[in-house]
Interface confidence: medium
């Protein structure tokens, strides 16, 4: 039709100019399209340079849309992480503040001369919660051993207690149970509670990290071509009013995001495991009850030591011999009154219940994030056609889109008519992130069973702001002792504040 050959390019000029490109490139009327590399080669309003510019622009617009969607998810996960992290840290800080406020009055110098031991215990608990690679049982055992030596010395200032005598005291301690049941109870409950809290928060961190890293995966050249065809070829071919057919858009984006969709199974597993571990936040061995009440176990332990002092001393002398008397030392420490115990079970504040119910709802909402991404982007960003099937843009002309919609994931793109996908070459970044999801899921499952799991930070971007309570940057690195080191797969995500050197192992 001779009339169509001289059709004006006014609409294309308007759209192209609105994108910020120079209008001097745009032909006044349609020209022959043999030069086109992506769009069908009919009469066109696009020069080679215009086609290239629009291809680059469509590529950038899809990447931006992807990043926007990812950012919303990342922000949600980051908010959750901050809320839970703040709550758990608040529980521990509250416990430490209560200890600092009540122990000097309750225990006098038995506390004040050992304040560092208690402060360091809380620092270790914080580090443990934050994912440092240490064994909590070993840490607690060391704490009780050191504390026993110091308190025994204080309770008997009239005795000379050299290092070898203290060594003997240490060997006797397990059988004598100088602190009563408190160390055992604290060990059992704290391990379960802390491992549940830290694995949940770390799960949120890993999820957020995966989203961030996947959002940075570049779209390939085949995807760029297909997106250009989807979004701008209709303009070039003189049908600027035609919007993409929904199934056509889905096939393009399923091809473009084939690797991302492969995250789906492990992503769901991770979120399921995270929802499941919140069961461990309640009850007498639950996170809230235990983390907020560490000080009460410590008070109980010191009370037990004071109550058992005479029996303990007699048994130590029996096992280690009579220590020499210190001629300059004062008489034995007067028996102090018992330190008053706060009720062990903290009444739940309601904060955690609210946080958990919000988290569960939000995690359920984003379970199908990766496989719903093509549909979401098509409906929200691509201005799809709502007209009848034969009036939409199908990549060649205005008309019905006939091919079937592909399945999700890389393997299902073998016959994608819109994007040439090499299903034998999965994206390595995304494979690594699938592995991170698997590792974290396994850790959450172990944590659910109450097992202490070593977290090792091998964060590849070294982020972390310092905890403010123990280590900052690499001024204080956290190492695990030889006997507890293990060859575990590193989890490449640090909790906020856990620096890269915390979590290193000693060689």
């Amino acid at each position: 039709d001779p009339a169509s050959k001289s059709r004006s390019c006014g609409e294309v000029r308007q759209i192209y100019g609105a994108k910020g490109f120079s209008l001097s490139d745009v032909p006044q009327a349609e020209i022959s399209g043999e030069h086109l590399r992506i769009c069908p080669q009919g009469y066109t309003c696009c020069t080679s340079e215009m086609e290239e510019n629009l291809a680059n622009r469509s590529h950038a617009e899809l990447e931006t849309a992807l990043r926007d969607s990812s950012r919303v998810l990342q922000a949600m996960l980051a908010t959750q992480l901050r809320s839970f992290d703040d709550h758990f840290q608040h529980l521990l800080n509250d416990s430490e503040r209560t200890l600092q406020a009540t122990f000097p009055g309750a225990f006098g110098e038995l506390y004040t001369q050992n304040a560092r031991a208690f402060r360091d215990l809380y620092s270790e608990l914080r580090l443990y919660y934050r994912g440092a690679n240490l064994h909590l049982e070993e840490t607690l055992a060391e704490f009780w051993a050191r504390l026993l030596e110091r308190l025994f010395k204080q309770l008997h200032p009239q005795l000379l207690l050299p290092d070898d005598y203290l060594d003997c005291l240490g060997k006797q301690a397990e059988a004598l149970r100088p602190f009563g049941e408190a160390p055992r109870e604290l060990r059992l409950r704290a391990t379960r509670a802390f491992v549940a809290a830290r694995s949940f928060v770390q799960g949120l961190g890993v999820a957020s990290d995966v989203v961030r890293k996947v959002a940075q995966v570049p779209l390939g050249p085949e995807c760029s071509r297909a997106v250009m065809k989807l979004v701008y070829c209709a303009h070039c071919l003189g049908v600027p009013g035609a919007r993409p057919c929904p199934d056509y858009c889905r096939n393009v984006l399923k091809g473009c995001l084939a690797n991302q969709a492969d995250l789906d199974a492990e992503w769901r597993n991770l979120l399921d495991s995270m929802v499941l571990i919140t069961d461990k936040f309640w009850g007498t061995s639950g996170v809230e009850s235990v983390i907020g009440s560490v000080h009460t176990w410590l008070a109980e332990a010191i009370n037990a030591l004071q109550d058992n002092r005479d029996t303990l001393t007699a048994k130590v002398i029996q096992g280690c011999g009579n220590p020499k008397v210190n001629p300059q030392g004062p008489g034995p420490e007067e028996k102090r009154r018992r330190g008053k115990l706060a009720p062990r079970e903290r009444p739940p504040s309601g904060t955690l219940e609210k946080l958990v119910s919000e988290a569960k709802a939000q995690l359920r909402d984003v379970q199908d994030f990766w496989i719903s991404l093509p549909g979401t982007l098509c409906s929200e960003k691509m201005a799809l056609s709502t007209a009848s099937d034969d009036r939409c843009w199908n990549g060649m002309a205005r008309g019905r889109y006939l091919p079937e919609v592909m399945g999700d994931g890389l393997a299902n793109q073998i016959n994608n008519p819109e994007v040439e996908v090499d299903i034998t070459k999965p994206d390595m970044t995304i494979r690594q992130q699938i592995m991170q999801l698997k590792i974290m899921t396994n850790r959450l499952r172990s944590a659910y069973n109450g097992n202490d799991v070593d977290f090792q930070d091998a964060s590849d971007d070294g982020s972390g702001s310092g905890s403010g309570d123990g280590c900052l940057d690499d001024l204080c690195s956290r190492k695990v002792s030889r006997k507890s080191s293990s060859s575990r797969t590193p989890l490449t995500h640090a909790l906020p504040g856990l620096s890269e050197q915390e979590g290193q192992k000693t060689s």
């Epitope: 240490l134 060391e142 310092g466 280590c471 204080c476 190492k479």
Partner: antibody
Framework: AVTLDESGGGLQTPGRALSLVCKAS????????MYWVRQAPGKGLEFVAG????????GYGSAVKGRATISRDSGQSTVRLQLNNLRAEDTGNYYC????????????????WGHGTEVIVS | ALTQPASVSANPGETVKITCSGG?????YGWYQQKSPGSAPVTLL????NRPSDIPSRFSGSKSGSTATLTITGVQAEDEAVYFC???????????FGAGTTLTV
């Protein structure tokens, strides 16, 4: 009596690495944190590095962070300081010190000092 | 860093007080004496006011809030030295020292 003997000092080349060793005796080594403290000519004391009794906690002064590594060997009762990428400002006396505490890294807890080993980076 | 006066002077028999501030409240201080540059420091007091057995009782320590004070009661000529305080940086958990106070008797 507690004794701390430092060795490994001397004239060093800028950019190279330095390894200092402190041999401890007269106390139960595995019970206490150990530190390295240095003093540049005409200057005050500066905390270089410390290590807790178990070897799990280490702390570093800001001037050496990223260049220093402290380690301990309880079997040998030694503490080692490795300082990489030496600079002229690393010149000074390096003292080994014992803490009264098992915990790293508080400079309020030092109860014994070695005689020091002189390091000259030139 | 910890803040100390650069110098103090006293006559024999007088009481001298050297202050050290800038540490984190709730953390202890130690006091160390160095008689000549390059000689090994000697611990006078550790963890606020614990005195090693060979240190004379005229050296004592106290702490109020985040300021520590070393008191030398009845100062003697042999006390002429540089005195350093030490504590811990509560954020980095690394040791810190004051710049030193020169005592002239």
């Amino acid at each position: 009596a507690v004794t701390l003997d430092e060795s490994g000092g001397g004239l060093q080349t800028p950019g190279r690495a330095l390894s200092l060793v402190c041999k401890a005796s007269g106390f139960t080594f595995s019970r206490y944190a150990m530190y390295w403290v240095r003093q540049a000519p005409g200057k005050g004391l500066e905390f270089v590095a410390g290590i807790g009794n178990t070897g799990r906690y280490t702390g570093y002064g800001s001037a050496v962070k990223g260049r220093a590594t402290i380690s301990r060997d309880s079997g040998q009762s030694t503490v080692r300081l490795q300082l990489n990428n030496l600079r002229a400002e690393d010149t000074g006396n390096y003292y080994c010190a014992k803490s009264v505490s098992p915990y790293c890294c508080d400079a309020a807890d030092i109860d014994a000092w070695g005689h020091g080993t002189e390091v000259i980076v030139s | 860093a910890l803040t100390q006066p650069a110098s103090v002077s006293a006559n024999p028999g007088e009481t001298v007080k050297i202050t050290c501030s800038g540490g984190s409240s709730g953390y202890a201080y130690g006091w160390y004496q160095q008689k000549s540059p390059g000689s090994a420091p000697v611990t006078l007091l550790y963890s606020n006011n614990n005195r090693p057995s060979d240190i004379p009782s005229r050296f004592s320590g106290s702490k109020s809030g985040s300021t520590a004070t070393l008191t030398i009661t009845g100062v003697q000529a042999e006390d002429e030295a540089v005195y350093f305080c030490g504590s811990v940086d509560s954020s980095s958990y690394a040791g810190i020292f004051g710049a030193g106070t020169t005592l002239t008797v």
